[in-house]
Interface confidence: low
């Protein structure tokens, strides 16, 4: 089951993610997709970091916090009702399968005729940002391949069968926070 | 110091069933891609199954349905129960682990299993 | 699956002489995000497990002899003894480690002339 956040019409939606980078600027690949998150890599990239930067994004999605220390939350700008949905956060691990993946629910609700600020979560409370390093030395990012025509359709059964049955609670846990290293 | 020992080898009887156990250095356990290999007389290394840190495992086809991977986190044990053994399933089996934040692969020493009447 | 092939099956080589073992991917294991080859290429001798060499193609495990040299992009790749020592006689694995299952070579087995 994805963990849900709300936000109206023409507001920001946010949706949390975040990782510990395994020393200061050893960063890991992440991918943000529209759809669950497949077996490999992101469907319908929306935006990609590599071990450097942003180096891939779409109008009205981007990253708010500092990523360079493992915040990969994706704001969404002036969202409308097409945006809801799940949303995939996948932080690309070094080894093969072992990438984390978080399946976020985003549920868009009219405009009221007042507007009021988008309702969102205590997240300083629900979803602590383990942001502490850990004391290993450079690791070369090894991530799978990039499958950018990825068939959601074809693969959705498999996607199902490794859907990570401990993923509810480790999003209770620790939100979706995770330690590189 | 990282260390894999595996045990459970040993002469069974074609139908029979094995289990192979290793035992595996904390950190390198509870972060690690673990995986089975395995090297039958005079043949290649095969990667028998692999599970990953939150379990979710894979398997050469020559095995699925016979052969389970495990993981005891507790215990910081690998285990690969061996079911319908055939005569093809003799080998010397391998325990590997990898870390997420290293390429390289660190093995185990390695336990025979034989299989025949 | 990537299928990977060997070639040769094996090779005898007098001491001193160059070895080079062949690998072929079924697909490209390379990743263009990292300019990284996903393939490792390791030694196997009888009673040992196996042995580390090259990872991403040519870089060189810690305390390997500089003798060994892993070269190639793409789908194809090469390993390189340069000056063949009675210690190198082994089996040579390539594999990629590109996507799940990561799948090895046949072996190619290498002796002395």
């Known amino acids: 089951s994805e963990v849900e956040y709300r936000a109206e019409v023409g507001q920001n939606a946010y949706l949390p993610c975040f990782y510990t980078p395994a020393a200061p600027g050893n960063l890991v690949p992440v991918c943000w997709g529209k759809g669950a998150c497949p077996v490999f890599e992101c469907g319908n990239v929306v935006l990609r970091t590599d071990e450097r930067d942003v180096n891939y994004w779409t109008s009205r999605y981007w990253l708010n916090g500092d990523f360079r220390k493992g915040d990969v939350s994706l704001t969404i700008e002036n969202v409308t009702l097409a945006d809801s949905g799940i949303y995939c956060c996948r932080i690309q691990i070094p080894g093969i399968m072992n990438d984390e993946k978080f399946n976020l629910k985003l549920v868009i609700k009219p405009a009221k005729v007042t507007p009021a600020p988008t309702r969102q979560r205590d997240f300083t409370a629900a979803f602590p940002r383990m942001l502490t390093t850990r004391g290993h030395g450079p690791a070369e990012t090894q991530t799978l391949g990039s499958l950018p025509d990825i068939n959601l359709t074809q693969i959705s059964t498999l996607a199902n069968e490794l859907r990570d049955s401990r993923l509810a609670n480790d999003l209770r846990d620790s939100g979706a926070t995770i330690r590189i290293g | 110091e990282v260390q894999l020992v595996e045990s459970g080898g040993g002469l069974v009887q074609p139908g029979g069933s094995l289990r192979l156990s290793c035992a595996a250095s904390?950190?390198?356990?509870?972060?690690?891609?673990m995986t089975w290999y395995r090297q039958a007389p005079g043949k290649g290394l095969e990667l028998v199954s692999s599970?990953?840190?939150?379990?979710?495992?894979n398997y050469a086809d020559s095995v699925k349905g016979r052969f389970t991977i495990s993981r005891d986190n507790s215990k910081n044990t690998l285990y690969l129960q061996m079911n319908s053994l055939r005569a093809e399933d003799t080998a010397v089996y391998y325990c590997?682990?990898?870390?997420?934040?290293?390429?390289?692969?660190?093995w185990g020493q390695g336990t025979q299993v034989t299989v025949s009447s | 699956d990537i299928q990977m092939t060997q070639s040769p099956d094996s090779l005898a080589v007098s001491l001193g002489e160059r070895a080079t073992i062949n690998c072929k991917s079924s697909?490209?294991?390379?990743?263009?995000?990292?300019?990284?080859?996903?393939l490792g290429w390791y030694q196997k001798k009888p009673g040992q497990p196996p042995k580390l060499l090259i990872f991403?193609?040519?870089t060189r495990e810690s305390g390997v002899p500089d003798r060994f040299s892993g070269s190639g992009s793409g789908t194809d790749f090469t390993l390189t003894i340069s000056s063949l020592q009675a210690e190198d006689v082994a089996v040579y694995y390539c594999?990629?480690?590109?996507?799940?299952?990561?799948?090895l070579g046949g072996g190619t087995k290498v002796d002395i002339k």
């Open positions: 904390g950190s390198i356990f509870s972060n690690g891609y």
């Open positions: 594999q990629q480690y590109y996507s799940t299952p990561r799948t």
């Open positions: 991403w193609a040519s």
């Open positions: 590997a682990a990898l870390l997420p934040h290293e390429i390289r692969k660190y």
């Open positions: 599970i990953n840190s939150r379990g979710v495992t």
């Open positions: 697909q490209s294991v390379f990743y263009n995000s990292n300019n990284k080859n996903y």
